[in-house]
């Protein structure tokens, strides 16, 4: 296993609809044809997997059916979008990249993106 640098933004603010997007960029030492990207969430020293996708030559990442993530790739950049976020989902979201093929296997883990989620205020009743 060889180490690889992964860069991601330090902070992202989710939209009022609970959507957060960020770019995860990896310094590929060669031309990988098969890449696996995993998003991990770290909160209160607990690390959980949010979503993962293996992609090849296409520009769209395909996630499992119940995933809250979507994404696209371009070169060594992966554009990730996480949906359905609420205030309780605020935390550090870490991008993990694995170059699966061809050998050698490379692994890179970013420093994480702190995603802040603010639940929208309910609209006050309006009298007309």
């Amino acid at each position: 296993c060889k180490a690889m640098h992964v860069a991601q933004p330090a902070v992202v603010l989710a939209s009022s609809r609970g959507i957060a997007s960020f770019v995860c960029e990896y310094a590929s030492p060669g031309k990988a044809t098969e890449v696996r990207v995993t998003v991990l969430r770290q909160a209160d020293s607990q690390v959980t997997e949010v979503c993962a996708a293996t992609y090849m030559m296409g520009n769209e990442l395909t996630f499992l059916d119940d995933s809250i993530c979507t994404g696209t790739s371009s070169g060594n950049q992966v554009n990730l979008t996480i949906q359905g976020l609420r205030a309780m989902d605020t935390g550090l979201y870490i991008c993990k990249v694995e170059l699966m093929y061809p050998p050698p296997y490379y692994l890179g883990i970013g420093n994480g993106t702190q995603i802040y989620v603010i639940d929208p205020e309910p609209c006050p009743d309006s009298d007309f």
Epitope: E34, M56, M57, N59, E60, F63, L64, P102
Partner: antibody, heavy 115, light 106 residues
Framework: QVQLVQSGAEVVKPGASVKLSCKAS????????INWVRQAPGQGLEWIGR????????YYNEMFTGRVTMTRDTSTSTVYMELSSLRSEDTAVYYC????????WGQGTMVTVSS | DIQLTQSPSFLSASVGDRVTITCSAS?????IHWYQQKPGKAPKLLIY???TLASGVPSRFSGSGSGTEFTLTISSLQPEDFATYYC?????????FGQGTKLEIK
Amino acid sequence: QVQLVQSGAEVVKPGASVKLSCKASGYTFTSYWINWVRQAPGQGLEWIGRIAPGSGTTYYNEMFTGRVTMTRDTSTSTVYMELSSLRSEDTAVYYCARGDYFDYWGQGTMVTVSS
Amino acid sequence: DIQLTQSPSFLSASVGDRVTITCSASKSVSYIHWYQQKPGKAPKLLIYDTSTLASGVPSRFSGSGSGTEFTLTISSLQPEDFATYYCQQRTTYPLTFGQGTKLEIK
């Protein structure tokens, strides 16, 4: 030129298994997914699963989980799909297709499940 | 699973007509891809990533849409366009296809 050549037609009995092959040529075999799609007579297209020929990573449609196995042989640039516990509803043309975009397709293999 | 519903399922048209086929997704998807299939043949990629024409596909074919609503348009039907058309998504597993739209000569 890119080609996907599939094995010949099969007639199998209910409960049996069938192993189909898809031989790729004309491109770098390990750079693209190989997908399997089937089409029952007069019906639409149904995705069965895919394999990454380099690592062997697979994704299967849950409808087929437990019944389908996809493997590859990089030395011959061939992908195999085995479907077990066959029933009459599995009678269909089975296609392999390349990549994320399904830009090249095999000619199809007709599988008939009949007693 | 993401369901894709095509409308209409059957369409009768004449050479030279402009026709539009719609693909509706049960959940928002990033892209839609379109395939053409003729009887006894394997499907053929027409349009990928919603609007990009595959190699060798005539410019009378076009695709558009976003989110849950997508369309395939043929600006002026040619005799060789009479076939069945399928949309497909690959945003989430399992990859799914629409039920197909059969385009017939009026």
